[in-house]
């Protein structure tokens, strides 16, 4: 807390300008009117204030707006945004995408801070859902944003917003998140033709069920191995050798290099060795000929 002292004669600020960089902290506190600061916030960013001077300016705004800053001030915070705490930001009502962009721009290159996380949370909650424009903006600044959300939060993403998602935005998503996103993507892209549909849905396939993979295998999609390796193991296991061969097309040869890794390893263990041999890849570990395969999960379901 800066103690209250009278402003020295002739030092009362009439506008926010560069002369203020020469003011000591107590002079800024005493000589800068908070209302003047609020109306000229757009100038602050152009003036090379120290962090300590910015602390004083923040304190003045806090006194003027104890219930939270108005959006007209928030939009022009600039560097001062980096001084805000999550508690400060929780008092804000940010509705304009332009304001969000301005603040994310200030934070560009910084780590995703608690302040930014709080700002985004406030903004999205205020909008009620993660619409396409917001998602576009957030993933532009933070490619990993989508995967930082819980499955519950992702459930509020409307299918229409999925069009804003780029493959790299899903790089760090886990299967639980893809389980939520995949049905939305399927809905969003449902009117596209086969090859275009596959290009769009490919990044989301880590959430696809067996029946959708079977359907894709009938469409000559030539799935690459990187995509195949990200599929849910439980979705891959029921696929036949013929279905996997059709699904991968020319990429089927890549199975040999991945035979020790999931889901390929587990899939191999479920196939008849005879069937695996038809691929001509030398895949080993399938069920030997003459063995009877009992589906215990089916047996449990019936009992």
């Amino acid at each position: 807390e800066v103690e209250k002292t009278a402003c020295p004669s002739g030092k009362k600020a009439r506008e926010i300008d560069e002369s203020l960089i020469f003011y000591k902290k107590w002079e800024l506190e005493a000589c800068v009117d908070a209302a003047l600061l609020a109306t000229q916030m757009d100038r602050v960013n152009a003036i090379p204030f120290t962090y300590e001077q910015l602390d004083v300016l923040k304190h003045k705004l806090d006194e003027l707006y104890p219930q939270g800053y108005p959006e007209s001030v928030i939009q022009h915070l600039g560097y001062l945004f980096l001084k805000m705490s999550p508690e400060d930001i929780r008092k804000w009502n940010v509705t304009s995408l332009e304001t969000l962009k301005a603040l994310l721009e200030v934070n560009k290159g910084h780590e995703m801070s608690p302040q930014v996380a709080t700002l985004i949370d406030r903004f999205v909650k205020g909008r009620g859902q993660l619409d396409k424009d917001t998602l576009d903006t957030l993933t532009a600044f933070y490619p990993g944003y989508l995967c930082s959300l819980s499955p519950e939060e992702l459930s509020s993403v409307p299918p229409s917003s999925i069009w804003a998602v780029r493959p790299q935005d899903l790089d760090t998503c886990d299967p639980r998140q893809l389980d939520v996103l995949y049905p939305k993507a399927r809905l969003a892209f449902q009117n596209m033709n086969g090859s275009e549909y596959f290009v769009k849905i490919q990044s989301f396939l880590g959430g696809a069920p067996t029946e959708d993979l079977k359907a894709l295998s009938q469409q000559n999609v030539s799935m690459d191995l990187a995509t195949f390796m990200k599929l849910r193991t439980d979705a891959v296991l029921p696929l036949t050798v013929a279905e996997v061969q059709k699904l991968l097309g020319p990429h089927v040869e890549g199975l040999k290099a991945e035979e020790r890794h999931r889901p390929v390893r587990d899939w191999i263990l479920r196939q008849r060795q005879d069937d695996l041999d038809t691929l001509g890849l030398g895949l080993q570990g399938g069920i030997p000929n003459g063995y009877l395969v009992l589906d215990l999960s089916m047996q449990e379901a019936l009992s």
């Epitope: 090379p48 560097y79 705490s85 290159g109 910084h110 780590e111 608690p114």
Partner: antibody, heavy 117, light 107 residues
Framework: QVQLVESGGGLVKPGGSLRLSCAAS????????MTWIRQAPGKGLEWISY????????YYADSVKGRFTISRDNAKNSLYLQMNSLRAEDTAVYYC??????????WGQGTLVTVSS | DIQMTQSPSSVSASVGDRVTITCRAS??????LAWYQQKPGKAPKLLIY???VLQSGVPSRFSGSGSGTDFTLTISSLQPEDFATYYC?????????FGQGTKVEIK
Amino acid sequence: QVQLVESGGGLVKPGGSLRLSCAASGFTFSDYYMTWIRQAPGKGLEWISYISSSGSTIYYADSVKGRFTISRDNAKNSLYLQMNSLRAEDTAVYYCARDRNSHFDYWGQGTLVTVSS
Amino acid sequence: DIQMTQSPSSVSASVGDRVTITCRASQGITRWLAWYQQKPGKAPKLLIYAASVLQSGVPSRFSGSGSGTDFTLTISSLQPEDFATYYCQQSNSFPRTFGQGTKVEIK
């Protein structure tokens, strides 16, 4: 008087790790932002990371992002730089400095990091 | 990123000379500019910040001017202890960037 003393430099193989420390004295450490700046032999200065007074705001230059981690312990008046996956191009004298936003007003004497096989 | 370009890269001068070093930013930085002096084997030392504010304890023969994209560091009367390398640095945006340095040598 304000003093910043770096330590932890040395010779490390490519791919290796090193942790630099900066001990601060003569000022209220917890009130100030801090920065790491490096200088390759015979070259200019490169700003690589900063951390806010509380530690909640952090920035890394692209050249070290994902490999280096800045942190601070205000109770110990110390700043740290954890450097992983080191490369030959990380060879430099590493300085810690007090960051005032518009300038760096005090610098340590530097600690040399050499990355070589 | 904002590029900072200093000129000249080196200057030879005698004691008592007036020396001027310029620094140009690739985009406008208002007055977010600082100047540092570095001697061999030593850490840089702050001379000027906010383009023209002299750091406490720095001799008044050093002065800075400029705003926007063009800035100048002037040493009005060069002293023996001033032979060093000088760097400009912008704080207008992240990442902070430095000029490549100007070496002031004895003629």
